[in-house]
């Protein structure tokens, strides 16, 4: 560092800023002599509002720094970004954000739940706000699927009026024909591929509608949509295998005790989806008067043994093997429960007693030509064989 | 030496977004000091809109913070503009400067012209 | 902060000393930068920290001031120098003055 050149005065001795180190220290700062900064842990380099990595300044031939010394400035991670379904709350101290400040996230209670951390996060060296696993980013308020106003899935019969909050998760999708979906998390609807195949190339033209039970009301949530993701296994006019479609939403819907997402099956689901166990679909498609429904109508059926249920479409006019390991039955044999055309894509549900949610088992599908035909049948799509496939457009979209 | 360079489409619909882009080279923007987007409206009137550091941490000015996002890509050294729900009182020349408050020099971008207009 | 630069052009003559002038709405000790623009050209730095000049420019500007008041002198005007001049304060976020032009008398 020393360079002696007599000729030259020595700079000024620099005084370290409060919470800084200089070094090398020196007797004294001749000519190219340099000293850096060095700030204590939650501590940073700024020269006003501008932030430094490193700080070096050079003694000059007139006996002055080629630079003015810099602020050890105590890390300020800022205001913590809004958690969009949540809030944050200051444990340090109102609006305090500096180094080693502790925040608090939650999410709205009742209708979303945190996922990723605990929602604590500290203001590190570094500048961000970490959480104790190491996140940077925020955790994410998750809804709470599956919940109902209804409590038990009832005793079987024909349609009923559903009422308010009973099938929040039940989706209008308008746009070429009338069908449904379910809603699930904040921004996709599954659905039947059947319902959505001419639009697949032109998701926008779905006119998507939810939080509302009269079909033709003016009060609903609208929804828009984003992409139509239809099963690569599915063949339009060859069968109904691999009936299923998921539309990402081109925003996140708002959840409340009118919108709420439908669960997907755990594991364990198969235990509640046994044959005779009862399974609820919920649409405004045709009733037995032959016109669509008005008001959202529910049907409490039994699941149907699938070897009496391929058998039921073994005879003509359906080909053999119409019925796949892909779907399941659900119906009365002596008929006069089922769903029906506009119905399409809805959810089959069931309620899983150990979390006490409901959960969509199936996707309606198909069935005879004559809805609650006795001896038929109406299909389903079964979801359970297909959440990697969910789970995975979920995740890359 | 160093350079900045910025790019993006020269005219946007109000209430879109407007996303610029600024390419840097000849220094890595995580080796040091705060990477800015600076506005000048007709008439000269310069405004900052904020800067991303070298660490990746962002300020930004306190009348654009609801509308404005500055993020970058390190393994293409380059940072980017968003600016939501713009009006045509968003039509500017953008630069992109590296400030440093006399901590090495300053370098700017040669701006770029974006209009606002339906 | 508001950064003031109440004299919206200045005339001045080749060889003339002209000083510009900044008055910040807080104080905002030594961190103010000057630059110099000219037509269809993005801002050059001179002047960081109120007083210290960059590299490479010459030595007829100088920078003074701290606090509130801060000055910008050009002794011996050259024709190159006839531009626009901003100040600009990074004390506290970062906000510019309205800027000066310099023209010939």
């Known amino acids: 560092h020393h360079h002696h050149h007599h000729a030259s005065q020595p700079c000024p001795y620099p005084m370290a800023p409060p919470n800084g180190h200089v070094s090398p220290v020196q007797a004294k700062y001749i000519l190219k002599d340099s000293f850096s900064i060095f700030c204590e842990t939650g501590y940073e380099l700024l020269q006003g509002h501008l932030p430094l990595k490193s700080f070096t300044a050079v003694c000059q031939k007139d006996g002055s720094w080629d630079r003015p010394m810099p602020a050890c400035s105590i890390v300020d991670c800022g205001p913590p970004d809004d958690l969009p379904s949540g809030r944050v709350e200051y444990i340090t101290g109102p609006g305090v954000t500096t180094y080693k400040a502790v925040i608090q996230y939650s999410c709205e209670e009742t209708f979303y739940t945190m996922k990723v951390n605990d929602g604590k996060y500290v203001c590190e060296a570094d500048g961000f706000w970490t959480s104790s696993k190491g996140e940077k980013s925020l955790p994410v308020c998750e809804p709470v699927c599956g919940l109902s106003a209804r409590t038990t899935g009832g005793r079987i019969y024909g349609g009923q009026k559903a009422k308010p909050g009973d099938f929040p998760w039940q989706v209008l999708i308008l746009g070429g024909t009338t069908a449904a979906g379910a809603l699930l998390y904040d921004n996709w609807v599954l659905t039947a591929a059947h319902a959505v195949y001419e639009q697949k190339h032109d998701a926008s033209a779905l006119d998507i509608r939810m939080g509302t039970l009269k079909r033709l009301s003016p009060h609903y949530t609208q929804a828009w949509s984003e992409a139509v993701f239809i099963h690569e296994g599915y063949t339009h006019d060859a069968g109904f295998d691999n009936d299923i479609a998921l539309i990402k939403l081109n925003n996140k819907v708002v959840i409340n005790s009118n919108i709420t997402p439908i669960c997907l099956p755990r594991k364990e689901a198969e235990s509640f989806m046994r044959t005779d166990d009862i399974g609820t679909a919920s649409g405004w498609g045709l009733t037995q008067r032959g016109f669509l429904a008005r008001n959202l109508m529910y049907v409490d059926i039994p699941i149907v043994d699938h070897q009496k249920c391929t058998a039921a479409y073994e005879k003509p006019p359906y080909p053999r093997g119409s019925v796949t390991a892909n779907m399941l039955c659900a119906g009365l044999e002596s008929g006069g429960k089922d769903s029906c055309r506009g119905d399409a894509g809805g959810a089959l549900v069931f309620l899983d007693s150990e979390t006490e949610r409901w959960f969509v088992g199936g996707i309606v599908s198909w069935g005879s030509m004559n809805c609650g035909e006795a001896g038929q049948y109406g299909v389903y799509t079964k979801v359970i064989n297909y959440i990697p496939w969910i789970e995975n457009i979920i995740s890359d979209f | 030496d160093v350079q900045l360079q910025e790019s993006g489409p020269g005219l946007v619909k109000p209430s879109q977004s407007l996303s610029l882009t600024c390419t840097v080279t000849g220094y890595s923007i995580t080796s040091d000091y705060a990477w800015n987007w600076i506005r000048q409206f007709p008439g000269n009137k310069l405004e900052w809109m904020g800067y991303?550091?070298?660490?990746?941490?962002?300020s930004y000015n306190p009348s654009l913070k609801s509308r404005i996002s500055i993020t970058r890509d390190t393994s293409k050294n380059q940072f980017f503009l968003q600016l939501n729900s713009v009006t045509t009182e968003d039509t500017a020349t953008y630069y992109c400067?590296?400030?440093?408050?006399?901590?090495?020099?300053?370098?700017w971008g040669q701006g770029t012209s974006v209009t606002v207009s339906s | 902060i508001v950064m003031t630069q109440s004299q919206k052009f200045m005339s001045t003559s080749v060889g003339d000393r002209v000083s510009v002038t900044c008055k910040a709405s807080q104080n905002v000790d030594t961190n103010v930068a000057w630059y110099q623009q000219k037509p269809g050209q993005s801002p050059k730095a001179l002047i960081y920290s109120a007083s210290y000049r960059y590299s490479g420019v010459p030595d007829r500007f100088t920078g003074s001031g701290s606090g509130t008041d801060f000055t910008l002198t050009i002794s011996n005007v050259q024709s190159e120098d006839l531009a626009e001049y901003f100040c600009l304060q990074y004390n506290s976020y970062l906000t510019f003055g309205s800027g000066t032009k310099l023209e010939l008398k």
């Open positions: 991303i550091s070298y660490s990746g941490r962002t």
């Open positions: 400067a590296k400030l440093g408050g006399g901590h090495g020099m300053d370098y």
